[in-house]
């Protein structure tokens, strides 16, 4: 099938990173600077993609793949590919249509983009609250309050190794 | 790659509990909370709770509220979701959902289903 | 607590646009996220934050979202897109901070 295939169409020999150039007789040409081909057979070379303003350079386009662009510091990707940049806020806020706004009482944001999340409700669980909350952080739960008899001391709780949030890009 | 794989179908009695399991590969599981949503016959989506797997913190929604424990061991990336004193509208698939990293986003990676059958 | 409407069904033509609704007092302030759901398949995530598609999800599905009306188009609609539509809020209060809309069936005729 293959050959036959070829024999057919002499643009299914062109790999990636060229295109099938009916100028030339159909002859495979290289894809033209700034341009890409990542599957072969193709009749055009595609557009390499440009990470400009607030986008930057992930990875540089090649003559087979596209560039991948990433957000400038202080903003951070959202769609398919970083389709877009949205600005970060502070940790404690969260970002509304109209802009940064810090987190009602009851309610916290340890990253810098999202909305402020409610405080766990510790006795939802049968536990008291140990460490409050604030606008950066989530109240910490300890042990039940029966647990808490006088002269029962409480231990606090090891450093969480990391916290819950930090999607890779 | 990220994956949730669940416990199977189970069958219960009306006022008897079920403990679902979810299983997390392919990334760090206390990095990200667990949400659990059910679907009954022919009914919609229904958020029941949050668990954070770092912390063990939590937030169920108000219609389940003493009836719903999510739990959670690090140690084989696993979270649980607890429904006690079973009805037969509880009869419902179960999945759990990975949060993206970030609240107030869609959850972008979820388990295959638990379907909990509460008959009599 | 927080309520977003649905319309049951939304029926089109193969090749069509399909404009799925949903309704909630001011939503255009919240951020909107929706997911197609097949019989016996888990809920997939097609569109999140009003606007923006995940990885692996085709162009001809968009969002938008202003006002009290978020809406979810599907453009050159095929049968594989014949499923149930669902949206979805988070909010900050701590009673019920998930919500999800009734669902909306798409049908190809």
């Known amino acids: 099938f293959e050959r036959t295939r070829s024999l057919q169409d002499p643009c299914s020999n062109c790999p990636a990173g060229t295109f099938c150039d009916n100028n030339r007789n159909q002859i495979c040409s290289p894809c033209p600077p700034n341009s890409f081909s990542s599957a072969g057979g193709q009749r055009t070379c595609d557009i390499c993609r440009q990470c400009k303003g607030v986008f930057r350079t992930r990875k540089e386009c090649s003559s087979t793949s596209n560039a991948e662009c990433d957000c400038t510091p202080g903003f951070h990707c959202l769609g398919a590919g970083c389709s877009m940049c949205e600005q970060d806020c502070k940790q404690g806020q969260e970002l509304t249509k109209k802009g940064c706004k810090d987190c009602c009482f009851g309610t916290f944001n340890d990253q810098k983009r999202g909305i402020c999340r409610p405080w766990t409700n510790c006795s939802l669980d049968g536990k008291s609250v140990l460490v409050n909350g604030t606008k950066e952080r989530d109240v910490v739960c300890g042990p039940s309050p029966a647990d808490l008899s006088p002269g029962a001391s409480s231990v606090t709780p090891p450093a969480p190794a990391r916290e819950p949030g930090h999607s890779p890009q | 790659q990220v994956q949730l794989v669940q416990s199977g179908a189970e069958v219960k009695k009306p006022g008897a509990s079920v403990k679902v399991s979810c299983k997390a590969s392919?990334?760090?599981?206390?990095?990200?909370?667990m949400h659990w949503v059910r679907q009954a016959p022919g009914q919609g989506l229904e958020w029941m709770g949050w668990i954070n797997p770092n912390s063990g913190g939590t937030n169920y929604a108000q219609k389940f509220q003493g009836r719903v424990t999510m739990t959670r061991d690090t140690s084989i990336s696993t979270a649980y979701m607890e429904l006690s004193r079973l009805r037969s509208d509880d009869t419902a698939v179960y999945y759990c959902?990975?949060?993206?990293?970030?609240?107030?986003?869609?959850?972008?990676?979820w388990g295959q289903g638990t379907l909990v059958t509460v008959s009599s | 607590s927080y309520v977003l409407t649905q319309p049951p069904s939304v029926s089109v033509a193969p090749g069509e646009t399909a404009r799925i609704t949903c309704g909630g007092d001011d939503i255009g302030d919240k951020r909107v996220h929706w997911y197609q759901k097949k019989p016996d398949q888990a809920p997939v995530l097609v569109v999140y934050e009003d606007r923006y598609r995940p990885s692996g999800i085709p162009e001809r599905i968009s969002g938008s979202n202003s006002g009290n009306t978020a809406t979810l188009t599907l453009s050159r609609v095929e049968a594989g897109d014949e499923a149930d539509y669902y949206c979805?809020?988070?909010?900050?209060?701590?009673?019920?901070?998930?919500?999800f809309g009734g669902g909306t069936q798409l049908i190809i005729l």
């Open positions: 959902a990975r949060e993206p990293g970030y609240y107030g986003s869609g959850l972008d990676y």
């Open positions: 392919g990334y760090s599981f206390t990095g990200y909370y």
């Open positions: 979805q809020v988070w909010n900050s209060s701590s009673d019920h901070p998930g919500v």
